[in-house]
């Protein structure tokens, strides 16, 4: 894109972080080989990417997790990419589901989500999972990002 | 992006190739329905995509493999997207892990990696896997590419 | 990209739809949180994304499915991203394969495909699967899109 000041590049890539919070929303950090192009996209409260400009964005997330069928609920592991726009209810943009592995003690699996969506100024995107304790936080395994078209 | 000569499009998409090399680095070729936009991105030694211009790039890889749990080590199949910048050590950008299947003789699985990263002039990206003999090289199953924002 | 009228943004994201058709080509709709930037990309017959302008496009698809090894053929579940250019034969751009789960009644798995390809004016892309009856059409699980670089 290599845009001028009127039209700067906007992109982010953040890295997963283990959290003591008992929430299904994954936590992220600007650490390791992260990307934060400028202040037109920000990581808020370690949980959501918020954009200042309206437009089309390619948004993606990757989640690696380790689970076992016997030790988990019958429901699959689901990762959801969600949107919160100002004055609107949250909504699901993308989801992926993987049934738990029969491998012991747990079987690793990776999920990738990605798509093009219109975001309003102040819109935030975040990632939900069914069980955050199963998520792998080793280098490169779980990440989240976006780029403005 | 449709950029002028000062700011040309930079993109690549290369196709996996079976190799007699006993290395964990996957081999690629400009064959089939490949993309190589211009000489600002090149495929070097059939193993790495090297860029001439600094900037933000969306880099991705897809690896399909066939493996069996009994015949494999307990470790999962891991695909890693790695970066080598001039004068720097290699580093992992992204990884995905899938536990081997119990299917006989082997169970196929596909991994997709992708993210936005800042690359320096002369930086190279490549893909590592735990066992290249398990990788599927049928049409469309395993590929690697990037695009400059 | 934020382009002028001469060079508008071109992007689409469409949502899967269950179909009574006995075809392996997945059906899509402009519903929910979909994207259709302008008439330079269109959804035709609910099955293919067709572009009016030549250029490089990042094309992606995500398919979530639920299958069981005993109830399925020995062949894996395969999702294919295919191209039909005017006056040319169809060709496979990308494929992913996942062996069926042993989970009962079925095990869910998600596949993600994505890559950069040159498209000609009037070119269409579509998604084929081995068994459409296994595809999950819940919110966000199965989608298809593209963006012009």
């Amino acid at each position: 894109m290599q845009k001028g000041d009127q039209n700067p590049q906007i992109a982010a890539h953040v890295i997963s972080e283990a959290s003591s919070k008992t929430t299904s929303v994954l936590q992220w950090a600007e650490k390791g080989y992260y990307t934060m192009s400028n202040n037109l996209v920000t990581l808020e409260n370690g949980k959501q990417l918020t954009v200042k400009r309206q437009g089309l964005y390619y948004i993606y997330a990757q989640v690696t997790f380790c689970s076992n069928r016997e030790a988990s609920s019958q429901a699959p592991f689901i990762a959801s990419l969600c949107l919160k726009s100002p004055g609107r209810f949250e909504r699901i943009l993308l989801r992926a589901a993987n049934t738990h592995s029969s491998a012991k003690p747990c079987g690793q699996q990776s999920i990738h989500l990605g798509g093009v969506f219109e975001l309003q100024p102040g819109a935030s995107v975040f990632v939900n999972v069914t069980d955050p304790s199963q998520v792998s936080h080793g280098t490169g395994f779980t990440s989240f990002g976006l780029l403005k078209l | 992006m449709q950029k002028g000569d000062q700011n040309p499009q930079i993109a690549a998409h290369v196709i996996s190739e079976a190799s007699s090399k006993t290395t964990s680095v996957l081999q690629w070729a400009e064959k089939g329905y490949y993309t190589m936009s211009n000489n600002l991105v090149t495929l070097e030694n059939g193993k790495q995509l090297t860029v001439k211009r600094q900037g933000l790039y969306y880099i991705y890889a897809q690896v399909t493999f066939c493996s069996n749990r009994e015949a494999s080590s307990q470790a999962p199949f891991i695909a890693s997207l790695c970066l080598k910048s001039p004068g720097r050590f290699e580093r992992i950008l992204l990884r995905a892990a899938n536990t081997h299947s119990s299917a006989k003789p082997c169970g196929q699985q596909s991994i997709h990696l992708g993210g936005v990263f800042e690359l320096q002039p002369g930086a190279s990206v490549f893909v590592n896997v735990t066992d290249p003999s398990q990788v599927s090289h049928g049409t469309g199953f395993t590929s690697f590419g990037l695009l400059k924002l | 990209m934020q382009k002028g009228d001469q060079n508008p943004q071109i992007a689409a994201h469409v949502i899967s739809e269950a179909s009574s058709k006995t075809t392996s080509v997945l059906q899509w709709a402009e519903k929910g949180y979909y994207t259709m930037s302008n008439n330079l990309v269109t959804l035709e017959n609910g099955k293919q994304l067709t572009v009016k302008r030549q250029g490089l496009y990042y094309i992606y698809a995500q398919v979530t499915f639920c299958s069981n090894r005993e109830a399925s053929s020995q062949a894996p579940f395969i999702a294919s991203l295919c191209l039909k250019s005017p006056g040319r034969f169809e060709r496979i751009l990308l494929r992913a394969a996942n062996t069926h789960s042993s989970a009962k009644p079925c095990g869910q798995q998600s596949i993600h495909l994505g890559g950069v390809f040159e498209l000609q004016p009037g070119a269409s892309v579509f998604v084929n699967v081995t068994d459409p009856s296994q595809v999950s059409h819940g919110t966000g699980f199965t989608s298809f899109g593209l963006l012009k670089l």
Partner: nanobody, 115 residues
């Protein structure tokens, strides 16, 4: 192009033995496994046995203890020693291998177990 050629099939009495061979030819860069499937008349093709590149063998329950798979990696050849054959082992036996990143199949060899 890689090819798989089976040999060793034939007619044998119940309780007898046969040794099948599968030779891979062509430019072979990598091998993950070689092995066997079989298809009895009017039935689906079923997996029989596999030997993986690390030497690990695997067998279907129906042939465990009677069949032994082995490989000569220097010759890109796999062998299936079939002992204590039963009439229900009658089938076309297909060599299957994961070579150069793809599933390859032989043309098949007929094994008939009958008195």
């Amino acid at each position: 192009e890689v090819q798989l050629v089976e040999s060793g099939g034939g007619l044998v009495q119940p309780g007898g033995s046969l040794r099948l061979s599968c030779a891979a030819s062509g430019r072979i860069f990598s091998t993950y496994f070689m092995g066997w499937f079989r298809q009895a008349p009017g039935k689906e093709r079923e997996w029989v046995s596999t030997i993986y590149s690390n030497g690990t063998p695997a067998y279907a329950d129906s042939v465990k203890g009677r069949f032994t798979i082995s490989a000569d990696n220097s010759k890109n050849t796999a062998y299936l020693q079939m002992n204590s054959l039963k009439p229900e082992d009658t089938a076309v036996y297909y060599c299957a291998a994961w070579l150069n990143g793809g599933n390859r199949w032989g043309q098949g060899t007929l094994v008939t177990v009958s008195s």
